[in-house]
């Protein structure tokens, strides 16, 4: 049985800044004609039937939801785009993660201007600072990692306050293992 | 209270190991910076670089970077600094230093008594 | 990235005002305002007295002021007592992950 597509994201954020870009690309076991992909926005077809649909200059139009579908093959699951006007952007590698799977963040200044003290927060709490922008990396994330996170940081010597971010860390599905 | 209580003094022969520590207590010890500086006999202060427990991200000062480890493990709230072969010229007092987030400010506002190391053959 | 500049010595009498200099460049104390200043003791661990260029820790008396301007940053201690012989460190952020601090400074109370 043919397994479903999967959209993934390069860069892999989908939070970006208007005026930025990304592309999604439909990936799947043993799909070689390139031609016959279907792309759907906010459950519309689109016109794009190759493997990578481009996002060029995003608007905000574009956020919403894509799934793609190779020939017959069950469409894809939806992964969500939200484009923003801010000065700062916290991203995520995922918004949902399995327990034990990486996670990273990172605190994205508008038009990739520097942005100077950033301090990241995790439930109102700082979290992580330093004196220029930097990430935050766990290699296994746990459920404690879960929570709503924001960043600060200095554009221009003034102070901004990024959107906030829910993070759900989920435990990963237990084996089930059956006697003969 | 804060307090950063390092391991004792050591003395060692060129070409030993050694990784000496620093615990941190009083404080949520994976959420603060620990940094390692250096102070040679009757020099000043060289800082070697730092680790944030949390996520154990790791930066080096320029003349450390490959020279030394620095290591940290958050559930026992302590932070290392390791070499694998020792030299004469690393005979020094080693601080380590707590960089906190303080009012808006980013400062090293509590500081080990220090590892004296002696490296002599 | 070399250590920041100071003065080898300076002294004073007690009741006198000291000011030690601390340069550095454009990539250091003059491109960023995270300039701290420490107290060292012999035999002992340092000590911050002055953050973010001039803000002063809590239990730090007043007289221990500090200022920057352009390369340079200062640190002024007035009304000098006996206690404050002790060697003075400044410190900047200095880019690309790095920390920097200076020579050091030995203050005498004559």
């Known amino acids: 049985v043919p397994q479903k597509p999967k959209v993934s994201l390069n860069p892999p954020w989908n939070r970006i800044f208007k005026g930025e870009n990304v592309t999604l690309t439909c990936n799947g076991n043993n799909f070689f004609e390139v031609s016959s992909t279907k792309w759907f926005h906010n459950g519309s077809l689109s016109e794009e039937t190759n493997s990578s649909l481009n996002i060029v200059n995003a608007k905000f139009e574009d956020s919403g939801e894509y799934k793609c579908q190779h020939q017959q093959v069950n469409e894809s699951e939806p992964v969500y785009l939200e484009v923003f006007s801010d000065w700062l952007l916290l991203q995520a590698s995922a918004e949902v993660v399995m327990e034990g799977q990486p996670l990273f963040l990172r605190c994205h200044g508008w038009r990739n201007w520097d942005v100077y003290k950033v301090i990241y927060y995790k439930d109102g709490e700082a979290l992580k600072y330093w004196y220029e922008n930097h990430n935050i990396s766990i290699t296994n994330a746990t459920v404690e990692d879960s929570g709503t996170y924001y960043c600060t940081g200095k554009v221009w010597q003034l102070d901004y306050e990024s959107e906030p971010l829910n993070i759900t860390v989920i435990k990963a599905p237990r084996e089930k293992y059956w006697l003969q | 209270e804060v307090q950063l209580v390092q391991s004792g003094a050591e003395v060692k022969k060129p070409g030993e190991s050694l990784k000496i520590s620093c615990e941190g207590s009083g404080y949520r010890f994976s959420s603060y910076w620990i940094a390692w500086v250096r102070q040679k006999p009757g020099k000043g202060l060289e800082w070697m670089g730092i680790?944030?427990?949390?996520?154990?991200?790791?930066k080096y000062g320029p003349s450390f970077g490959g020279q030394v480890t620095i290591s940290a493990d958050k559930s026992i709230n302590t932070a290392y600094l390791e070499w694998s072969s020792l030299k004469a010229s690393d005979t020094a007092m080693y601080y380590c230093?707590?960089?906190?987030?303080?009012?808006?400010?980013?400062?090293?506002?509590?500081w080990g008594l220090g590892t004296l190391v002696t490296v002599s053959s | 990235q070399s250590a920041l500049t100071q003065p080898r010595s300076v002294s004073g009498s007690p009741g006198q005002s000291v000011t030690i200099s601390c340069t550095g460049s454009?990539?250091?104390?003059?491109?960023?305002?995270?300039v701290s200043w420490y107290r060292q003791y012999p035999g002992e661990a340092p000590q911050l007295i002055i953050y973010?260029?001039?803000g002063r820790p809590s239990g730090v008396p007043d007289r221990f002021s500090g200022s920057k301007s352009g390369n340079t940053a200062s640190l002024t201690i007035s009304g000098l007592q006996p206690e404050d012989e002790a060697d003075y460190y400044c410190?900047?952020?200095?880019?690309?992950?790095?920390?920097?601090f200076g020579t050091g400074t030995k203050v005498t109370v004559l």
């Open positions: 973010d260029v001039s």
């Open positions: 410190s900047s952020y200095a880019g690309s992950e790095i920390y920097v």
């Open positions: 680790i944030y427990p949390y996520d154990s991200d790791t």
């Open positions: 454009r990539g250091d104390v003059g491109g960023y305002d995270f």
């Open positions: 230093a707590r960089l906190a987030l303080i009012r808006g400010s980013i400062i090293f506002d509590y």
